[in-house]
């Protein structure tokens, strides 16, 4: 009778992460008697994947019933495949021995390759807000994909950006890869409603590319413009002075009125109006009793916006 051969018909198998891999193996004879074992890798450092005789292998199931006397099919299924499972798997026949079984013959091996989708891209912006005309950096990260080939694009409001740098790690062979990209974006006063989008395309994606977004509303600070105006004199020598605070973002704003350098009133912006571009306007007024002053009065509207140093605008009130 011809000597037993271990046949692994598939040189290579490609599996999607999360799926089940079937590794086929048949023997050409029932003799010699002894168990089959599956290993990943060859040589002394090989990893035991399945032992017909003993052990607990929760992810592995056999295709056939190995307890049947005439069984020669030693194929296995490995469930919930991850990129870490990639490698060459060997089906090895052992001859029954005492005290230990002796390795008799190995199959040629089946190389298992794994394709894995990239994780949803995560976009993060700068820790501190920046003002228009400044350049800020955004980062985009996606992990766990295989194979290594991947494309990443940046968009601002649908317009593709060109000022970015991308790295895919590691540079050499690996079971899975990560991508990291940094894009530079110049802020404008109209960017409160703007979005920065990182788009990742990979062979495993059946839909459109994966997208990660960042809202520039979390990054931008638009400082207010101030205008102080005097309204016509009212009865009983009262003058109404208004401070128009325009085009600011975010809403966090505190306004202080000063009369000749002395604090008259402090208030926090509450009932603001929103502009189409997402910035806010607010108006504060001060009623000044002219008869209480002998000399001209310097009125100052002082605004502290979003924790920044105060900006102010003054108005000289003539007392005739």
């Amino acid at each position: 009778e011809e000597e037993l051969q271990v046949i692994q018909p598939d040189k290579s198998v490609l599996v999607a992460a999360g799926e089940t891999a079937t590794l086929r193996c048949t023997a050409t004879s029932l003799i010699p008697v002894g168990p089959i074992q599956w290993f990943r890798g060859a040589g002394p450092g090989r990893e035991l994947i399945y032992n017909q005789k003993e052990g607990h292998f929760p992810r592995v199931t056999t295709v056939s019933d190995l307890t049947k006397r005439n069984n020669m099919d030693f194929s296995i299924r490995i469930g919930n495949i991850t990129p870490a499972d990639a490698g060459t798997y060997y089906c090895v026949k052992f001859r029954k021995g005492s005290p230990d079984d002796v390795e008799f013959k190995s199959g040629a091996g089946t190389e298992l390759s794994v394709r894995a989708k990239p994780s949803a891209p995560v976009v993060s912006g700068p820790a501190a807000r920046a003002t228009p005309q400044h350049t800020v950096s955004f980062t985009c990260e996606s992990h766990g994909f295989s194979p290594r080939d991947i494309t990443l694009k940046w968009f601002k409001n649908g317009n593709e950006l060109s000022d970015f740098q991308t790295n895919v790690d590691p540079v050499g062979e690996s079971v899975s890869y990560s991508i990291h990209s940094t894009a530079k974006v110049v802020l404008t006063r109209e960017d409160v409603h703007s979005q920065v989008i990182c788009e990742v395309a990979h062979v495993t994606l059946q839909g459109d590319p994966l997208r990660g977004t960042a809202n520039l509303s979390e990054t931008i600070r638009v400082p207010p413009t101030l205008e102080v105006t005097q309204q016509p004199v009212r009865a009983e020598n009262q003058v109404n002075v208004t401070c128009q605070v325009r085009k600011f973002y975010p809403q966090r704003l505190q306004l202080t009125w000063l009369e000749n350098g002395n604090v008259s009133r402090t208030e926090t912006a509450s009932t603001v109006t929103e502009n189409k571009d997402g910035t806010y306007n607010w108006m504060s007024w001060l009623l000044v009793n002219v008869s209480a002053h002998r000399d001209d009065v310097k009125l100052t509207c002082q605004v502290e916006h979003d924790g920044q140093p105060a900006v102010s605008k003054s108005h000289d009130l003539k007392v005739s």
Partner: antibody, heavy 116, light 109 residues
């Protein structure tokens, strides 16, 4: 799992025509689908794909002449102003479950003849 | 666009022969290459994907190899049902577009 193309016929130059690809055994919302064509005695030519979410992508030569769309069970190829060089068998195909780099299921094709 | 050059355009062979068809890409496509078999009046059938993986149900006499720009389809022992036209098809991961080779017709000698 099956794909069947329909709508192919003899048309005059300048005429529009819409081909359909009806699928069974799987969901169009899970796979990228493609359209291809093959002129008589010639090789295979890629026309375009539609992603699982419904976004179409076209070969550079298409130049807006063709439009790919889909419903829950059919994918359509709308062809404007047909020319004699558009005479071909048109195939629809589905990409493999492991990635969009190959097509593992094809329809039998439908013949479009453009002639006056 | 990427160009795929297949050779030979046709070949004559006998049953039992070893047949090799090559496909060259105008730029690297890594391993994103598929091989199809097509018979007259029929749709293409997938044989090999990702350059070297045998599609389920395809006889093991078919094998694929290569990466980058040069690829090979080998039929180890030609059978009567293998007389057909064979196409390579690339996918470019940056342009996300597909290109076919012009085909190789395998005829009976």
């Amino acid at each position: 799992v099956q794909l069947v193309e329909s709508g192919g016929r003899l048309v005059q130059p300048g005429t529009p025509l819409t081909l359909s690809c009806t699928v069974s055994g799987f969901s169009l919302s899970s796979y990228v689908m493609g359209w291809f064509r093959q002129a008589p005695g010639k090789g295979l030519e890629y026309i375009g794909i539609i992603s699982s979410s419904g976004s179409p992508y076209y070969a550079s030569w298409v130049n807006g002449r063709f439009t790919i769309s889909k419903t829950s069970t059919t994918m359509d190829l709308k062809m404007n102003s047909l020319r004699s060089e558009d005479t071909a068998t048109y195939f629809c195909a589905r990409v493999g479950p492991l990635g969009v780099d190959y097509f593992n299921i094809w329809g039998p094709g439908t013949l479009v003849t453009v002639s006056s | 666009d990427i160009q795929m050059t297949q050779s030979p355009s046709s070949l004559s062979a006998s049953v039992g022969d070893r047949v090799t068809i090559t496909c060259r890409a105008s730029q690297s496509i890594n391993s994103y290459l598929a091989w199809y078999q097509q018979k007259p009046g029929k749709a293409p059938k997938l044989l090999i994907y990702s350059a070297s993986f045998l599609y389920s149900g395809v006889p093991s006499r078919f094998s694929g190899s290569g990466s980058g720009t040069d690829f090979t389809l080998t039929i180890s022992s030609l059978q009567p049902e293998d007389f057909a036209t064979y196409y390579c098809q690339s996918w470019h991961y940056i342009s996300r577009s597909y290109t076919f080779g012009q085909g190789t017709k395998v005829e009976i000698k």
